[in-house]
């Protein structure tokens, strides 16, 4: 009824995940480098990163009929995330902070999304963009932005997973 | 109808000074980074400075790091070169150009260029 | 840093042949590339970005193709005013121009 197939989620291991994700997402925000918050006004990410939207099917009723929607929405911007996450943006110049959890972040990013789409199984793929390069000038503010973005996004799948798990599991 | 305009070009002595302007319209300034681009006579275009778009971050070709400073003032609309212990090499007509992208995930190409002011470093 | 090497450094064509001008990089740009053109007193003009896609107003007879280190910018039936100088432009890492091909009459 969920994932393709007809199989539902591992709901429960999906909430936990997805909680973790919520902490690594946070935790990674301040660790990017250091931010001059005036840039934070120069552009907005709304129309460039994956967003849950009201018609995805991600409340209770829209579970209730067809999980399948907003799991696969949900899927395809973790997608979206874990590609950004690997791209030039995290990996170039400046580095990264020793400490910073953004490397955790990227794997779970995957293990979730492995989870949701288990070998063998795919969605109706919706082509992820493509990302022109960074350069880096621009990087301290995408990461910041990215990371903003990617909280908002695993606080609303933690919602979903977490009431998936309450109600819908076997 | 966007509209770049820089002045401040003239002859320098070397080792000398000189701050270029740029004034720009028909566009929201604030959004976008800024970038300038020079051409020595008889040579090819070379990239050297670019702003983020607050001012708050910047970056230099190694041909002119710790010589040249980029600033902008937004509220005036106006992209600015400084240019300190010039040689003869520094010689070259300056642009400042505009991208031809906003939002996040930008290509560092160039929409939009200034008409250019010439820059003669000499004794 | 990137290298960009044009080629040739000039091409004599007469009004109404085709030209082909080459832009080579050291290490693979993907398709992030740019050509202009470039005539005296005036500023660069974008002709194409993203090694393939044309600038707003720009001709259908100017189109680009390439990827990775090999670009080519095609002008496919010469008009007087194409005569100039061409620059490519990589925005993979940094930015850095090709040296210019000068295009003139023959």
């Known amino acids: 009824r969920a994932v393709p197939g007809g199989s539902s989620p591992a709901w429960t291991q999906c909430q936990q995940l997805s909680q973790k994700l919520c902490t690594l997402a946070w935790s990674a925000h301040p660790l990017v480098g250091h931010m001059d918050l005036r840039e934070e006004g120069d552009e907005e990410t709304t129309n460039d990163v994956p967003h849950i939207q009201c018609g995805d099917g991600c409340d209770p009723q829209g579970l209730r009929d067809n999980s399948q929607f907003c799991l696969q929405r949900i899927h395809q911007g973790l997608i979206f995330y874990e590609k950004l996450l690997g791209s030039d943006i995290f990996t170039g110049e400046p580095s990264l902070l020793p400490d910073s959890p953004v490397g955790q972040l990227h794997a779970s990013l995957l293990g979730l999304s492995q989870l949701l789409q288990p070998e063998g199984h795919h969605w109706e793929t919706q082509q992820i963009p493509s990302l022109s390069p960074s350069q880096p000038w621009q990087r301290l503010l995408l990461r910041f932005k990215i990371l903003r973005s990617l909280q908002a996004f695993v606080a609303v799948a933690a919602r979903v997973f977490a009431h998936g798990a309450a109600t819908l599991s076997p | 109808e966007v509209q770049l305009l820089e002045s401040g070009g003239g002859l320098v002595q070397p080792g000398g000074s000189l701050r270029l302007s740029c004034a720009a319209s028909?566009?929201?300034?604030?959004?976008?980074?800024m970038h300038w681009v020079r051409q020595a006579p008889g040579k090819g275009l070379e990239w050297v400075s670019v702003i983020s778009p607050s001012g708050g971050r910047t970056w230099y070709a190694d041909s002119v790091k710790g010589r040249f400073t980029i600033s902008r003032d937004n509220s005036k609309n106006t992209l600015y070169l400084q240019m300190n212990s010039l040689r003869a090499e520094d010689t070259a007509v300056y642009y400042c150009a505009k991208l031809g992208t906003g939002g996040v995930f930008k290509s560092t190409y160039f929409q939009h260029w200034g008409q250019g002011t010439l820059v003669t470093v000499s004794s | 840093d990137i290298q960009m090497t044009q080629s040739p450094a000039t091409l004599s064509l007469s009004p109404g042949e085709s030209a082909t001008l080459s832009c080579r990089a050291s290490q693979s740009v993907g398709t992030y590339l740019a050509w202009y053109q470039h005539k005296p007193g005036q500023p660069p003009r974008l002709l194409i970005y993203?090694?393939?896609h044309r600038a707003t107003g720009i001709p259908a007879r100017f189109s680009g193709s390439g990827s990775g280190t090999d670009f080519t910018l095609t002008i496919s039936s010469l008009e007087p005013e194409d005569f100039a100088v061409y620059y490519c432009q990589q925005y993979r890492s940094l930015i850095t121009f090709g040296q210019g091909t000068r295009l003139e009459i023959k």
């Open positions: 028909g566009f929201t300034f604030s959004r976008y980074e």
């Open positions: 993203d090694a393939s």
